[in-house]
């Protein structure tokens, strides 16, 4: 099973220069339970919600959003009406957060390419995202790698050789930037919270098997949301309007009720039991 990926694409409509569309998609095996689109930054980290889409309950959208809709079972689009003459959308970062079962919550941000022609935009280039359950391994291997690298550095310095620069295998500038950022962020997340993994975040004792739409609980410690350069609007190398951040933990806020995640399982911010917050979440 491949690691989930999220892509974001922002484009200006060819017919109306004041009209923009944000496209977001989730590439992963899980079922999507909620999508949140925000602007000005990630949801819960300075961003303002523009729309929330639930696959069965419907959508909720707020100005300047004009129409939020599902394009496929794993992608959405959000049309925006730019009423201002100064076209503020052109310099804005748009973020899409996909909550999925069983992967958790994944968020990506993107902005309109600075010199893009109306109606044109590069195809989304998803970058591999690191699963939280790899973060612990990466954290440990990162320390070991750093140690080995440092020893190597000392040895080479003694031989008066220049330090070799490690390059990722990708040549795409987006991939280079995002990939270079992702491992360090994931490692930090693992060091900050070694329990932020999918496998250890449920409370098995509270799984509800009595109803098809039952609930399970999620400990608050799994709600860590690393933020990094990919959350910033000023990432000049990411010029084509689409980039991907690392997996951002599970559900963003410990006190926030997460979405309905699929048959027989939903996550809660604590372990009070399946009826602690009965029903299903959604924002229309």
């Amino acid at each position: 099973a491949g690691t989930p990926e999220v892509w974001v694409q922002v484009q200006m409509e060819a017919t109306e220069l004041s009209s923009f569309t944000v496209h977001c998609g989730f590439l992963g095996p899980g079922s999507i339970s909620l999508v949140t689109v925000s602007w000005g930054g990630p949801d819960g980290a300075g961003g303002t919600k523009l729309a929330v889409l639930h696959p069965e309950l419907g959508t909720r959208q707020w100005a300047p959003a004009r129409q939020a809709r599902w394009e496929t079972q794993s992608s959405i689009s959000l049309a925006l009406e730019d009423s201002g003459a100064s076209s503020p959308f052109a310099n804005t970062t748009f973020c899409c957060k996909f909550a999925s079962f069983p992967e958790g919550s994944w968020e990506s941000c993107g902005s309109l390419p600075p010199s893009s022609d109306p109606g044109l935009s590069a195809p989304p280039t998803p970058v591999p995202i690191l699963r939280a359950d790899l973060a612990g391994i990466l954290g440990l291997s990162g320390v070991l790698l750093f140690g080995c690298g440092y020893l190597l550095h000392l040895l080479r310095r003694q031989k008066h050789r220049p330090t070799p620069r490690l390059q990722p295998s990708h040549t795409n500038s987006q991939a280079l930037t995002a990939q270079a950022w992702a491992p360090s962020q994931a490692s930090q997340a693992a060091l900050h919270d070694p329990y932020a993994t999918i496998n250890t975040s449920f409370c098995p004792a509270t799984l509800d098997t009595a109803h098809p739409n039952g609930w399970a609980s999620l400990p608050t410690h799994a709600a860590h949301q690393p933020q990094g350069p990919a959350a910033s609007a000023s990432t000049p190398i990411l010029a084509r309007g689409s980039f991907v951040s690392v997996e951002n933990g599970l559900y963003t806020q410990a006190g926030e009720r997460p979405p309905h995640t699929g048959p027989g399982l939903t996550l809660f911010p604590d372990c009070r039991g399946p009826r602690a917050l009965e029903g299903r979440f959604g924002v229309r």
Partner: antibody
Framework: EVQLVQSGAEVKKPGSSVKVSCKAS????????IEWVRQAPGQGLEWMGE????????NYNEKFKGRVTITADESTSTAYMELSSLRSEDTAVYYC???????WGQGTLVTVSS | DIVMTQSPDSLAVSLGERATINCKSS????????????LAWYQQKPGQPPKLLIY???TRESGVPDRFSGSGSGTDFTLTISSLQAEDVAVYYC?????????FGQGTKLEIK
């Protein structure tokens, strides 16, 4: 446990205003919409509008635009619905709701009578 | 606005029998992108707020007995109670969850025959 607790019944004169409150608990108030729905005696349900407390973004039913104002106070996790220029037809039970109408307040009866 | 029309306005069914309520929308509630129907059903008992029963046209809300089921697509939907119980006496509403503003049907009053 998610709870929406509304203010008590009100009797108002035609032409006046009423402000109904809805205190939310059991979830992050700022993250999700609070909807307002009204139900006249023996009648159906009518959506009035909504607010997203985190950003105070609102959507209103065109029918009530100009007469209804929905606000929210994050510090107290309370949403408010104010209806002005009241007339007898506004006599109804007013409900607040959240999570796509999965959770509801107990309702507030507003009676408009001279 | 999408107009929701329910039929019948009232219905009397014997205990243990099947009850069927229909709902028709003036526009399709089907999203072609993900092939989901955005329709919900509510139950309201006297003096109480409505209670969500079904969403997505056919998904039962948590805790709702399995005698309640929803079906339909596009503009025509049905709520079925397979075996009527005394506690099912209530008014039932369908609701457009597809587009703004959310609109409700006029309601169907279900009684015991």
């Amino acid at each position: 446990e998610v709870q929406l607790v509304q203010s008590g019944a009100e009797v108002k004169k035609p032409g006046s205003s009423v402000k109904v409150s809805c205190k939310a608990s059991g979830y992050t108030f700022s993250s999700f919409s609070i909807e307002w729905v009204r139900q006249a005696p023996g009648q159906g349900l009518e959506w009035m509008g909504e607010i997203l407390p985190g950003s105070n973004s609102t959507n209103y039913n065109e029918k009530f635009k100009g007469r209804v104002t929905i606000t929210a106070d994050e510090s107290t996790s309370t949403a408010y619905m104010e209806l002005s220029s009241l007339r007898s037809e506004d006599t109804a039970v007013y409900y607040c709701s959240s999570y796509w109408f999965a959770y509801w307040g107990q309702g507030t009866l507003v009676t408009v009578s001279s | 606005d999408i107009v929701m029309t329910q039929s019948p306005d009232s219905l009397a069914v014997s205990l243990g029998e099947r009850a069927t309520i229909n709902c028709k929308s003036s526009q399709s509630l089907l999203n072609s992108g993900n092939q989901k129907n955005y329709l919900a059903w509510y139950q309201q008992k006297p003096g109480q707020p409505p209670k969500l029963l079904i969403y997505g046209a056919s998904t039962r809300e948590s805790g709702v007995p399995d005698r309640f089921s929803g079906s339909g697509s596009g503009t025509d939907f049905t709520l079925t109670i397979s075996s009527l119980q005394a506690e099912d006496v209530a008014v039932y509403y369908c609701q457009n969850a597809h587009s703004y503003p959310p609109t409700f049907g006029q309601g169907t009053k279900l009684e015991i025959k």
